[in-house]
């Protein structure tokens, strides 16, 4: 059980106050983290509170400003990047968001040696992506879907690609579906370790159907946003990978990297690229039916000026029970011999663990094992491997950092974080300097987040980087809800849940219950993290009990739970929420006449299906930006879990799992449907179809749209949204305003 101290003592009770909705909307109780921008084994950059860029040397204890806030302000810079030779800094301004990761910006190059901006051969604007080479100060950037190279910041650019076209050909940047569902980055180019080569992806979207929606703006006529967006079963982007020698790029030109034959025989995806050395690269490919992944190691042949990917260096990863990998196929972390690597994949018992691959996947040596999962490999050095897992005390929603000594035999394992601040910190991530000489630990909770700096050899804490003292003080007079993380055992399924309880919770009383659900494949909602958010307010001020439940399909508890939803989305996720609610009712403190459910995105889909389950458990519920039919969602994501919407594959379940098919069942619940009209991700179409089905079934419901808002419903829409949802729930639960 994780109990958040409510800090309520009788003597203090008068000075304590509940959270208000205003607190949440103003971000009054938001926390800070500190991630060093490492530039060597012992140095990092950090942007100070007054916006100076400061270089810190851990070993000398010295720090100095490398770039003043005056310089930053002169171009309204919101971000920066130091060249590896430390001669130049790029300054980023005019940030303009595109999709989840992508944005365009204006870039200025500042010469640190003379304290002036580089004049002549300035960069064009707006740029879609820009990065330094890993050594020296070469620049690669993407402008109007083409890639350019500068040997030095003041040099004229060399154009590497010429076929880039808006919404047609993307070079060095992903198209919509690769950005959102495969790469999870704004870029699709990768420098080799010493900057000799530049690899990049070309995405051809010429044949992809286009989603079009109105953007109302302020003009007399709305404009139409067009995005090549492959929905389930539609034509996909065609991807090619090229590598160019950046020393004399005009000589040989870009060289295409061959696709493994077993992949190229049908539709496929490129999933990631990892440089091993300057002359060895590792590419990962995935069949469109995403249960077969191939990792291909390619070598540069100087005499041929080509990239050779021998079949003997192809490693196949296949899933027989679900899809390949977790949310994504894991990426390899190469060891110092530049051919063997460490990788997370399912072991024979169906738990994701670290394996060491020297020759073939079949001969892989398992490094970690147990009924828990390795989650991320942070760093491999000559003698240590650092990773995170949820092994400690068998809580799947925790993350601790471990070190395995790979230099000694047998390898020994040490938990670096388990006992550091045990009550406060149970969910960590880490950031390592070169050669893991030092590292930062960022603890996200369950207590107030704290970031600390550590010695990579001894694991000794060197200093606190950020401890959120202001937040701690601000919370001293706040009645925070209590939180507990527990599990239910139902029909051989373990359902972990987090319950958020009002500050003066009394088990003998009855409380309204709100289920917050996401429930998407390979997600996890029950995590030991700190948050003061909308549901904290609902518990603190409005006296609701809020519960989050991780059911079948969720992550980090083994393949049996994860792959249970394979090819049948919308069934077990909903069943498990309902099962949990019944168990909560049995606990005796839930008013069974006042139970609601809400979710966003995938959670909106699950909440809609739960409301339409016909159980009579839910009085009301909210779906924000829900998927309503898997035929409307992106191919890469949907087909991973559902296969294809074709007669000979899985069309029947695509049809059976829609929200619209259950329109009649909404008759006895209060339903609030919410969507942004400019949602590029889960298209407004989804809610439009739900609304149409409900109207056709003559079922009353409430709805709210947010004009020109995307999937995030940000800015003023956020305030309106949470205010609106609060009113809806209070009305549903008969709570006075």
């Amino acid at each position: 059980i994780v109990l958040r101290p409510s800090r309520v003592h009788n003597s203090e009770e008068n000075t304590m106050r509940a959270l208000t909705l205003k607190d949440i909307l103003n971000g009054t109780f938001s926390y800070k983290t500190f991630f060093p921008n490492w530039i060597s084994g012992q140095e990092y950059l950090h942007q100070s509170a007054d916006n100076n860029i400061v270089l810190y040397n851990i070993e000398t204890g010295q720090s100095y400003t490398i770039l003043s806030n005056r310089t930053m302000k002169s171009v309204n810079a919101s971000n920066y990047g130091l060249s590896p030779d430390r001669q130049f800094v790029y300054l980023e301004s005019d940030y303009s968001k595109l999709w989840r990761y992508s944005y365009t910006a204006t870039y200025y190059i500042y010469d640190l040696s003379n304290g002036e901006f580089v004049r002549g051969n300035e960069l064009p604007r707006p740029i879609q992506y820009l990065c330094w080479s890993p050594v020296g100060s070469k620049l690669a950037y993407v402008y109007q879907n083409n890639i350019y190279l500068k040997q030095r910041p003041g040099d004229p650019p060399f154009q590497i690609t010429f076929n880039g076209r808006e919404n047609k050909i993307f070079n060095g940047i992903p198209d919509w579906v690769y950005e959102e569902e495969m790469l999870a980055t704004k870029y699709a180019l990768w420098w080799s370790p010493n900057g000799k080569f530049l690899a990049y992806a070309e995405f051809n979207d010429t044949d992809i159907p286009v989603i079009a929606y109105s953007y109302y703006g302020d003009e007399q006529y709305p404009r139409t946003i067009n995005i090549p967006y492959p929905k389930a079963g539609a034509k996909n982007p065609v991807v090619r990978i090229f590598i160019i020698d950046t020393t004399y790029p005009a000589y040989v030109g870009p060289q295409e990297v061959p696709v493994p034959a077993m992949i190229a025989s049908s539709d496929y995806y490129f999933s990631w690229l990892t440089w091993v050395t300057d002359e060895r690269v590792c590419l990962q490919w995935l069949k469109r039916v995403q249960n077969v992944s191939v990792l291909s190691i390619c070598d540069f042949r100087e005499d041929w000026q080509t990239w050779d990917c021998p079949k003997t260096q192809e490693h196949i990863e296949e899933s027989r029970t679900g899809w390949a990998g977790g949310f994504f196929v894991s990426t390899p972390v190469f060891s110092y011999d530049a051919i063997s690597y460490y990788k997370i994949f399912s072991d024979k018992d169906g738990y994701k663990h670290i394996h060491y691959i020297k020759d073939t996947v079949e001969n892989a040596i398992q490094i970690t094992s147990g009924k828990w999962e390795a989650i991320n490999i942070f760093r491999v050095t000559q003698d240590s491997l650092f990773y995170s897992s949820n092994e400690f005390e068998e809580y799947p929603g925790r993350r601790n950092i471990y070190r395995i000594s790979i230099g000694s035999y047998p390898p020994s394992k040490k938990c670096v974080t388990c006992h550091l601040r045990k009550e406060r910190c149970q969910y960590y991530t880490a950031s390592f300097s070169d050669y893991a000489k030092y590292y930062a630990l960022v603890c996200y909770g369950p207590g107030i987040p704290i970031s600390t700096l550590h010695d990579g050899r001894t694991d000794q804490e060197i200093k606190i980087l950020e401890e959120n003292k202001e937040l701690e003080n601000a919370l001293k007079n706040i009645q925070l809800p209590k939180e507990e993380i527990k599990k239910l055992e139902v029909d051989e399924i373990t359902l972990w849940y987090k319950m958020i309880l009002p500050p003066q919770f009394d088990r003998s009383k009855k409380y309204p219950l709100l289920i917050q659900v996401y429930g998407g494949p390979c997600s996890q909602s029950v995590r030991s993290v700190f948050a003061v958010n909308w549901i904290s307010y609902l518990a603190s001020k409005e006296g609701m009990v809020i519960a989050l439940v991780d059911g079948r399909g969720t992550a980090f508890q083994g393949d049996k739970l994860l792959y249970a939803v394979y090819r049948k989305l919308g069934v077990y996720e909903v069943e498990d929420q309902i099962t949990a609610v019944r168990k909560f009712i049995e606990m005796g403190f839930i008013d069974e006449k006042r139970i609601a459910i809400w979710g966003w995105s995938y959670g909106g889909y699950v909440s809609s299906l739960a409301l339409a389950s016909g159980t009579g458990l839910f009085k009301c519920g909210i779906a924000v930006a829900p998927v309503s039919s898997w035929e409307y969602y992106a191919s890469v994501y949907t087909e991973r879990f559902m296969g294809l919407p074709t007669k000979d594959d899985n069309l029947e379940h695509y049809k059976n799992s829609t929200v619209m098919a259950r329109a009649e069942y909404f008759r006895n619940v209060d339903y609030l449907l919410i969507h942004g009209t400019a949602d590029d991700n889960v298209h407004f179409q989804n809610s439009a179809q739900i609304a149409k089905a409900l109207v056709n079934a003559q079922v009353d419901f409430q709805a709210m749209w947010y004009s020109d808002q995307n999937h995030g419903l940000s800015g003023l829409s956020t305030n309106h949204l949470y205010t609106h949802m609060t009113h809806f729930l209070k009305q549903c639960f008969s709570l006075s305003d």
């Epitope: 002549g120 004399y248 005009a250 000589y251 000026q305």
Partner: antibody
């Protein structure tokens, strides 16, 4: 030893067509971008066209765009230049050269194309 | 397109003398993309220098290249009889790649 051997030149009337070939040997042909460069009698060098190693990308000088087509057959180690709608100003020695935009490290001996009525 | 202007048009020198050939670009060219070629009558051009200063395979060390930005130079330290020819500079910075009009080095 790298060798490039052009053929297919000759006399052609304005508006006519000609197809030049360049047989390559001594290197992994499919790995390299290749170019055509021409030289009008008594004049300097002018880049005409280039093609990537796989043949997937082609590039042309404005003066020949829409009239000339560069292609390659990697199984035959041969580079081609299909020239249509020929004009008097296309009269030149045509060289095939190894390289994309430069440097061009190996050149053929050239083949003369004369456009005249 | 980038225009390359070579000077002088003709250079009359004796064997053993030093030859300095200039190539000026209408806009900045990164040194990685500047090359020099030699062409003798009735022959194909031959690559001498690439990357503004790197000698191609088999090129004697009396040939050297230098320069950056818009001004580049080819130097032949001691002219040999076989060096009398036409020399072209070439840029690959922008499409289309362009050549200078050439400098003829002739025997004085």
């Amino acid at each position: 030893e790298v060798q490039l051997l052009e053929s297919g030149g000759g006399l052609v009337q304005p508006g006519g067509s000609l197809r030049l070939s360049c047989a390559a040997s001594g290197f992994t042909f499919s790995s390299y971008a290749m170019s055509w460069v021409r030289q009008a009698p008594g004049k300097g060098l002018e880049w005409v066209s280039a093609i990537s190693g796989s043949g997937g990308s082609t590039y042309y000088a404005d003066s020949v765009k829409g009239r000339f087509t560069i292609s390659r057959d990697n199984s035959k180690n041969t580079l081609y230049l299909q020239m249509n709608s020929l004009r008097a100003e296309d009269t030149a020695v045509y060289y095939c050269a190894k390289g994309w935009l430069g440097p061009f490290d190996y050149w053929g001996q050239g083949t003369l194309v004369t456009v005249s009525s | 397109e980038i225009v390359l202007t070579q000077s002088p048009g003709t250079l009359s020198l004796s064997p053993g003398e030093r030859a300095t050939l200039s190539c000026r670009a209408s806009q900045s060219v990164s040194s990685s993309y500047l090359a020099w070629y030699q062409q003798k009558p009735g022959q194909a051009p031959r690559l001498l220098i690439y990357g503004a200063s790197s000698r191609a395979t088999g090129i004697p060390d009396r040939f050297s290249g230098s320069g950056s930005g818009t001004d580049f130079t080819l130097t032949i330290s001691r002219l040999e009889p076989e060096d009398f020819a036409v020399y072209y500079c070439q840029q690959g910075q922008l499409i289309p790649p362009t050549f200078g009009q050439g400098t003829k080095v002739e025997i004085k």
